[in-house]
Amino acid sequence: KKKEKVKKGSECSEWTWGPCTPSSKDCGMGFREGTCGAQTQRVHCKVPCNWKKEFGADCKYKFESWGACDGSTGTKARQGTLKKARYNAQCQETIRVTKPCTSKTKSKTKAKKGKGKD
């Protein structure tokens, strides 16, 4: 829930804004509805369509420590347990992420799907 002080001549000083709802599909341009007393407003907004948003913002996980290096694959892994999901995000209860054992090379963390349709 987002609250915003509006310094205008109206009696409404605090607007409460709902989520950004895409006009079509799951992302892109949409509207956000705000309420203040009996007043309502709709403002344009945008939900990003990139993978980072889908995984990073919709599904938040609490991770355990990294496991030992697996010599056969050259990777180490850790498990994450769902901490919080956006209301309509269909997040996995647990995920497993891996990364190369070497700490010298910075590479992107690979993960099994954080979201998935039933």
């Epitope: 709902g18 509805e33 769902l82 901490k83 999901a85 209301y87 309509n88 996995q92 209860e93």
Partner: antibody, heavy 117, light 107 residues
Framework: QVQLVQSGGGLVKPGHSLRLSCAAS????????MNWVRQAPGKGLEWIGM????????ILNQKFKDKATLSVDIAKNSAYLQMNSLRAEDTAVYYC??????????WGQGTLVTVSS | EIVLTQSPATLSLSPGERANLSCRAS??????LHWYQQKPHQAPRLLIK???QSISGIPARFSGSGPGTDFNLTISSVEPEDFAVYYC?????????FGGGTKLEIK
């Protein structure tokens, strides 16, 4: 699976307050949104609001902004609904439900609140 | 807020018949529409989530369609235990809202 057991309902006088409890057991209570819904006798379902136990983020139906307060106690795996300045029209069965978009939801058994002098 | 209108208010059928329940939203809500069944003195029970997604433990005779503004819950062949009140609910924007309900009664 999550089991939700509700308590705290009963007869209350107009103008008084009441705190309803929703105790969770089973799978992780703190990972899922907790909704509160009420149903007046012979009427439909009405959403009061929801709270996320992990950080207490609360989204309240504006209709209840001066009436309801939501809270959680992670240590007790419980969610609470405080209802203030109760009136006869607040007489209803109050439900808590734990929501996951992935698996669906689980509901408490409901608790009846009767506001009468 | 988004208004959900359910029709018919009452549906009278015999066991074995097909039931079609409608829920219309006042604006597009994508697929963020869920169906509940409620029997007297019981909490609601989720039947279908996100317009058409099945729920574990719910019989296959229950199915849903969407998305957009017009949604339907279909019971392919009504069983005696299906006579109850059915509610739709949207989770597209706050406040979450429910339809007024459809009562499925024995003919």
């Amino acid at each position: 699976q999550v089991q939700l057991v509700q308590s705290g309902g009963g007869l209350v006088k107009p103008g008084h307050s009441l705190r309803l409890s929703c105790a969770a057991s089973g799978q992780s209570f703190s990972s899922y949104w907790m909704n509160w819904v009420r149903q007046a006798p012979g009427k439909g379902l009405e959403w009061i609001g929801m709270i996320h136990p992990s950080d207490s983020e609360t989204i309240l139906n504006q209709k209840f902004k001066d009436k309801a307060t939501l809270s959680v106690d992670i240590a007790k795996n419980s969610a609470y609904l405080q209802m203030n300045s109760l009136r006869a029209e607040d007489t209803a069965v109050y439900y808590c439900s734990s929501w996951s978009a992935k698996r669906g939801d689980f509901w408490g058994q409901g608790t009846l609140v009767t506001v009468s002098s | 807020e988004i208004v959900l209108t359910q029709s018919p208010a009452t549906l009278s059928l015999s066991p074995g018949e097909r039931a079609n329940l409608s829920c219309r939203a006042s604006e597009s809500i994508s697929n963020n529409l869920h169906w509940y069944q409620q029997k007297p003195h019981q909490a609601p029970r989720l039947l279908i989530k996100y317009a058409s997604q099945s729920i574990s433990g719910i019989p296959a005779r229950f199915s849903g369609s969407g998305p957009g503004t017009d949604f339907n819950l279909t019971i392919s062949s009504v069983e005696p235990e299906d006579f109850a009140v059915y509610y739709c609910q949207q989770s597209n924007s706050w406040p979450l809202t429910f339809g007024g309900g459809t009562k499925l009664e024995i003919k």
